[in-house]
Interface confidence: low
């Protein structure tokens, strides 16, 4: 009973929840649940019954494969979906799919926290601002990635003349999307444009 599959999809997309193996032959009943006890749809005696739920009108069952099609998924659809199959023998078998729905990340805004000449070098502190999202950050200087230590929302670095980059890019990403924001400097150490 340890079948658990993880799926991550972008909000607004159409999703197919299915299992990677064949259904048991001549099963008696197939039911999809949202969480552990909320029925979405049940197939029994060559007929599908759709239950009153937030999915009504958004789901379709393919009894041949057991696949459940959900249209226009939203973050509120995040859950573990369970497909339970009742075999002719009377035994039950279940499969679980953990669905994570993520919004596309918004375009980040780079905020210049601090920029100053220091010991003939350029001290730079930039923050990459996006509204309350759990994302990964990657910073680039003239399209070259900064080392991994710098991969959070704030870039703090001291640039020597041989290390100057003109433009700094913050790339925010989650597992379904990615967006960039860029700020450019005029050597040695002044803001040029966004």
């Amino acid at each position: 009973q340890g079948h658990l599959v993880h799926m991550t999809v972008v909000s607004g997309s159409n999703v197919t929840l299915n299992i990677s193996e064949s259904l048991p032959e001549n099963y008696k009943q197939l039911t999809w649940f949202y969480t552990f006890d909320q029925k979405i749809v049940e197939w029994d005696s060559r007929k599908s019954k759709y239950f009153e739920s937030k999915f009504k009108g958004r789901v379709r069952l393919d009894p041949q494969s057991g696949a459940l099609y959900i249209s226009k998924v939203q973050k509120e659809d995040n859950s573990t979906y369970i497909m339970r199959v009742l075999k002719k023998t009377g035994n039950e078998q279940e499969w679980k799919i953990k669905l994570q729905v993520l919004d596309p990340v918004p375009k980040p805004v780079i905020k210049i926290e601090k920029i100053e000449d220091m010991d003939d070098n350029c001290y730079l502190k930039l923050s990459c601002v996006i509204p309350g999202e759990s994302v990964n950050y990657t910073w680039y200087g003239d399209k070259r990635p900064f080392p991994k230590e710098l991969q959070n929302s704030v870039l703090e670095t001291t640039l020597m003349p041989h290390n100057y980059s003109r433009c700094y890019t913050c790339q925010v990403s989650n597992s379904v999307s990615s967006k960039n924001g860029t700020v450019c400097l005029s050597p040695p150490c002044t803001l040029a444009r966004s």
């Epitope: 220091m118 010991d119 001290y123 990635p145 080392p147 991994k148 710098l150 703090e156």
Partner: antibody
């Protein structure tokens, strides 16, 4: 001229604690990330910890995570490494080093020896 | 983490000879983020090369670095007496920062 001077090393029993200091001069200390790197006797170099210029971000090698704390006092131009639950394998010369653009280490202090032994 | 393997472990040479030290990475080092350090007994390491091939300030031009990806080389064109020391490579393209185990260049 950039100078880094470590202190605070010594002999400590397993399970004990020690605090290392690194006094910096010759540059605007608060503008640079700093790091600790160690070298066990007769062995190679191992990166230990990093702190950003403002002190807001810290990073640790897995081997010291949860036992070592890096911090800095920019008003005193001093970097620190607080070490607890010391083990024999922590015995090493500990160097503080200025991070150049979060890339390589340049320059390094002369090092301070930490010996963990019963 | 990226493992750096230096070879040979020890080199026994005479002043005036040309030296080639190798540093091989277990995976590609991004943007040639590789540095070389020299360390003499009882002293701290000193930066020689950064970015695989750029000489640090004050480093004589007999020291040169080359390579990219997984294979890097430090060359000393003509050994001077003060060059007998340990040499370490270090990658700074991915976390954690890692060093090679070192190559000892000793007088024959």
């Amino acid at each position: 001229e950039v100078q880094l001077l470590e202190s605070g090393g010594g002999l400590v029993h397993p399970g004990g604690s020690l605090r290392l200091s690194c006094a910096a001069s010759g540059f605007t200390f608060g503008g640079y990330a700093m790091s600790w790197v160690r070298q066990a006797p007769g062995k190679g170099l191992e990166w230990v910890s990093l702190i950003s210029g403002s002190g807001g971000s810290t990073y640790y090698a897995d081997s010291v995570k949860g036992r070592f704390t890096i911090f800095r006092d920019n008003s005193k131009n001093t970097l620190y490494l607080q070490m607890i639950s010391l083990r024999a394998e922590d015995s090493a010369v500990y160097y503080c080093a200025k991070y150049s653009n979060y890339d390589y280490f340049d320059p390094w202090g002369q090092g301070t020896l930490v010996t963990v032994s019963s | 983490e990226i493992v750096l393997t230096q070879s040979p472990g020890t080199l026994s040479l005479s002043p005036g000879e040309r030296v080639t030290l190798s540093c091989r990475a277990s995976q590609s080092v991004s943007s040639s983020y590789l540095a070389w350090y020299q360390q003499k007994p009882g002293q701290a390491p000193r930066l020689l090369i950064y970015g695989a091939s750029s000489r640090a300030t004050g480093i004589p031009d007999r020291f040169s670095g080359s390579g990219s990806g997984t294979d890097f080389t430090l060359t000393i064109s003509r050994l001077e007496p003060e060059d007998f020391a340990m040499y370490y490579c270090q990658q700074y393209g991915s976390s954690p920062r890692t060093f090679g185990q070192g190559t000892k260049v000793e007088i024959k």
